[in-house]
């Protein structure tokens, strides 16, 4: 992937739109939308003023760890859906799109240098462990997905892209 493709806001917006669509189709869906287990996902909240004071490398650590955990969670959701007796087709479609989207975003972040940045800061090892929450429905899973994209990921790429412009 071109190194700074993710710096084009339209790219992230495309994935965000997909995530919001997925969240919307699960609104009010009970019958097909339970995960039947608790899946660990990243907490999409941040300590606002601490985040603002963070080095971009520390932000990269949080985003990279969060993206990895979110990818695992969506893959687990996909596996549970495949194993269910009658997977609901619209849900299947959006889970597959989310898996594909997270793979692409991982590639785009790697191209931006997020992985390298996440490893390089001297305080990366002492960074606080990633805060997590659990999701027991596809609605919660997709909400975390869309909140992660429009939250930490957008904040980090904005900062990383700005830093790269200097």
């Amino acid at each position: 992937a071109p190194p700074r493709l993710i710096c084009d806001s339209r790219v992230l917006e495309r994935y965000l739109l997909e995530a919001k669509e997925a969240e919307n189709i699960t609104t009010g869906c009970a019958e097909h939308c339970s995960l039947n287990e608790n899946i660990t996902v990243p907490d999409t909240k941040v300590n606002f003023y601490a985040w603002k004071r963070m080095e971009v490398g520390q932000q990269a650590v949080e985003v990279w760890q969060g993206l990895a955990l979110l990818s695992e969670a969506v893959l687990r959701g996909q596996a549970l859906l495949v194993n269910s007796s009658q997977p609901w087709e619209p849900l299947q479609l959006h889970v597959d799109k989310a898996v594909s989207g997270l793979r692409s975003l991982t590639t785009l972040l790697r191209a931006l240098g997020a992985q390298k940045e996440a490893i390089s800061p001297p305080d990366a090892a002492s960074a606080a462990p990633l805060r997590t929450i659990t999701a027991d429905t596809f609605r919660k899973l997709f909400r975390v997905y869309s909140n992660f994209l429009r939250g930490k990921l957008k904040l980090y790429t904005g900062e990383a892209c700005r830093t790269g412009d200097r």
Partner: antibody, heavy 127, light 108 residues
Framework: QVQLQQSGPGLVKPSQTLSLTCAIS??????????WNWIRQSPSRGLEWLGR?????????DYEVSVKSRIIINPDTSKNQFSLQLNSVTPEDTAVYYC?????????????????WGQGTLVTVSS | SYVLTQPPSVSVAPGQTARITCGGN??????VHWYQQKPGQAPVLVVY???DRPSGIPERFSGSNSGNTATLTISWVEAGDEADYYC???????????FGGGTKLTVL
């Protein structure tokens, strides 16, 4: 339940210093997620944010540009309170002054909001 | 500095729906918070992050935000809803909160 109790004089002479205190109960001024603010309200300027203090491994202050040269917000950890000092006041500084807590542990796509407020103190600047 | 524009007053009959607007350049891309202030009292947060309600705030209070306008909607208006309402956003250029001028809601 967080409560903020304000104290301080209601009348200040021009060119003098306005001093107010906000005592916190139900939370800590050294909280690692909240920020502690002063906001004022007057008929001519509406609600106007003045500044904040917060602790994230060390103390930080942010001030509104228009008052930056004459404002100090100080935390007092021993009394679990924070104070406002506004120097060289003029009649334009006449307003109701509020202290307020800003919740800072929020969704990453959001911005902090004021979830608890003091009762307000009307401060009149007049000789 | 980012400017928020609110109508000075809105009137509504009890049981009807009140809509209070807050205008700002591309406000839809920002998070909007709403406060209610009754005479002689401090403001109270009624909606945050465009549409979320703090605990204790009735479901009658809801919010939306897109384009250049954010809206606070109060359904089944009661006499006790009569107050001033303020919107608030974050001015990212100066890293500080900005308030709208306020809207006086009158229940007829």
């Amino acid at each position: 339940q967080v409560q903020l109790q304000q104290s301080g004089p209601g009348l200040v002479k021009p060119s003098q210093t306005l001093s107010l205190t906000c005592a916190i109960s139900g939370d800590s001024v050294s909280s690692n997620s909240a920020a502690w603010n002063w906001i004022r309200q007057s008929p001519s300027r509406g609600l106007e944010w003045l500044g904040r203090t917060y602790y994230r491994s060390k103390w930080y202050n942010d001030y509104e540009v228009s008052v930056k040269s004459r404002i100090i917000i100080n935390p007092d950890t021993s009394k679990n309170q924070f104070s406002l000092q506004l120097n060289s006041v003029t009649p334009e500084d006449t307003a109701v002054y509020y202290c307020a807590r800003e919740e800072g542990y929020i969704e990453a796509h959001s911005v902090p909001y004021f979830d608890y407020w003091g009762q307000g103190t009307l401060v009149t600047v007049s000789s | 500095s980012y400017v928020l524009t609110q109508p000075p007053s809105v009137s509504v009959a009890p049981g009807q729906t009140a809509r209070i607007t807050c205008g700002g350049n591309n406000i839809g891309s920002k998070s909007v918070h709403w406060y209610q202030q009754k005479p002689g009292q401090a403001p109270v947060l009624v909606v945050y992050d465009d549409s979320d309600r703090p605990s204790g705030i009735p479901e009658r209070f809801s919010g939306s935000n897109s384009g250049n306008t954010a809206t606070l909607t109060i359904s089944w208006v009661e006499a006790g809803d009569e107050a001033d309402y303020y919107c608030q956003v974050w001015d990212s250029s100066g890293d500080h909160p900005v308030f709208g001028g306020g809207t006086k809601l009158t229940v007829l």
